[in-house]
């Protein structure tokens, strides 16, 4: 069966939107009015993995681009990257683990935990226009909580 996907945008708990500022550069900043059109639309695919009531494995692709968020160990540190894939083969139900995030819902907020690196989360900085990254701490300076807005396909 084909993998089930939905289109959405994400904003962090400070209401910063995610935008592409270059081919491999995902940054978080406040947008208003017409500029909201700049925000990235994700194709969130529901993939194979450990699942529970509040934890759902997903892959986050960029709509109409052959790019996925992935988590790799780079110089001994879990690192978030935008990775090019062959569009003929993606998305698929059984995604490689580096592409899988556990979407965790807590108090109407979402966290995206790396399946490859437990307790590492998609994070944004407090500062404006900084890259989205993989962070190993929750509840500190960096932001790990997001809200999701559905986008019609």
């Amino acid at each position: 069966a084909p993998v089930r996907s939905l289109n959405c945008t994400l904003r962090d708990s400070q209401q910063k939107s995610l935008v592409m500022s270059g081919p491999y550069e995902l940054k978080a900043l406040h947008l208003q009015g017409q500029d909201m059109e700049q925000q990235v639309v994700f194709s969130m695919s529901f993939v194979q993995g450990e699942e529970s009531n509040d934890k759902i494995p997903v892959a986050l692709g960029l709509k109409e681009k052959n790019l996925y968020l992935s988590c790799v160990l780079k110089d001994d540190k879990p690192t978030l990257q935008l990775e090019s894939v062959d569009p003929k083969n993606y998305p698929k139900k059984k995604m490689e683990k580096r592409f899988v995030f556990n979407k965790i819902e807590i108090n109407n907020k979402l966290e995206f935990e790396s399946a490859q690196f437990p307790n590492w989360y998609i994070s944004t900085s407090q500062a404006e226009n900084m890259p989205v990254f993989l962070g190993g701490t929750k509840g500190g300076q960096d932001i790990t909580d997001f809200t999701m807005q559905f986008v019609s396909s």
Partner: antibody
Framework: EVQLVESGGGLVQPGGSLRLSCAAS????????MSWVRQAPGKGPEWVSG????????GYADSVKGRFTISRDNAKNTLYLQMNSLKPEDTAVYYC?????????WGQGTQVTVSS | QAVVTQEPSLSVSPGGTVTLTCGLS?????????PGWFQQTPGQAPRTLIY???NRHSGVPSRFSGSISGNKAALTITGAQPEDEADYYC????????????FGGGTHLTVL
């Protein structure tokens, strides 16, 4: 303040190799894509190569594809360019730059001269 | 490989407005090309003016603005100053599988 310091250039014979390094400071290196750009004497800049944060996606100008390899060491805040099978037309000042599209104050670069 | 085209030279009077363009030999420029604009004066390294179509780099005067107009990227200088006399280069990301970026040949701007 963003600082990028290139090194490793020099005079090399055609067919030879060089490895350029770029030491980065003043920003969180591991969260940015990086690139190399070069400029030959009297010519405009030429984008050479780019690499994403984790090193899993790279890109190369057609003129260097198969001869140059970009890499990075996030623990050392350093970007590299391994240049093999060098040609006289690779002679240029080589700059490293923050972001894939080189959106940064550029450093002073390192001179590479390929000549017999 | 696609060629990035720019006007070889343009001139503007001090205080005047001038628009430099950046096109593709095949097809239209879109935001997916992440157009960037760079300024270079003799003996200096290039300096980033605009990235990602219309974002001014820090410290760049507000008289410089970027846009996409028709099928090209554009750099507009409103109220040109003598110190704006320089070479201007654009760069475009080639998203059609080649995964690289290409600079244009540059425009020499004279302010007289």
């Amino acid at each position: 303040e963003v600082q990028l310091v290139e090194s490793g250039g020099g005079l090399v014979q055609p067919g030879g190799s060089l490895r350029l390094s770029c030491a980065a400071s003043g920003f969180t290196f591991s969260t940015y894509a990086m690139s190399w750009v070069r400029q030959a004497p009297g010519k405009g800049p030429e984008w050479v190569s780019g690499i994403n944060t984790g090193g899993g996606s790279t890109g190369y100008a057609d003129s260097v594809k198969g001869r140059f390899t970009i890499s990075r060491d996030n623990a050392k805040n350093t970007l590299y360019l391994q240049m093999n099978s060098l040609k006289p037309e690779d002679t240029a000042v080589y700059y490293c730059a923050k972001d894939w599209m080189a959106t940064t104050p550029w450093g002073q670069g390192t001179q590479v001269t390929v000549s017999s | 490989q696609a060629v990035v085209t720019q006007e070889p030279s343009l001139s503007v009077s001090p205080g005047g407005t001038v628009t430099l363009t950046c096109g593709l030999s095949s097809g239209s420029v879109t935001t997916n090309n992440y157009p960037g604009w760079f300024q270079q004066t003799p003996g200096q390294a290039p300096r980033t003016l605009i990235y990602n179509t219309n974002n001014r780099h820090s410290g760049v005067p507000s008289r410089f603005s970027g846009s996409i107009s028709g099928n090209k990227a554009a750099l507009t200088i409103t109220g040109a100053q003598p110190e704006d006399e320089a070479d201007y280069y654009c760069a475009l990301y080639m998203s059609s599988g080649s995964n690289n970026a290409v600079f244009g040949g540059g425009t020499h701007l004279t302010v007289l």
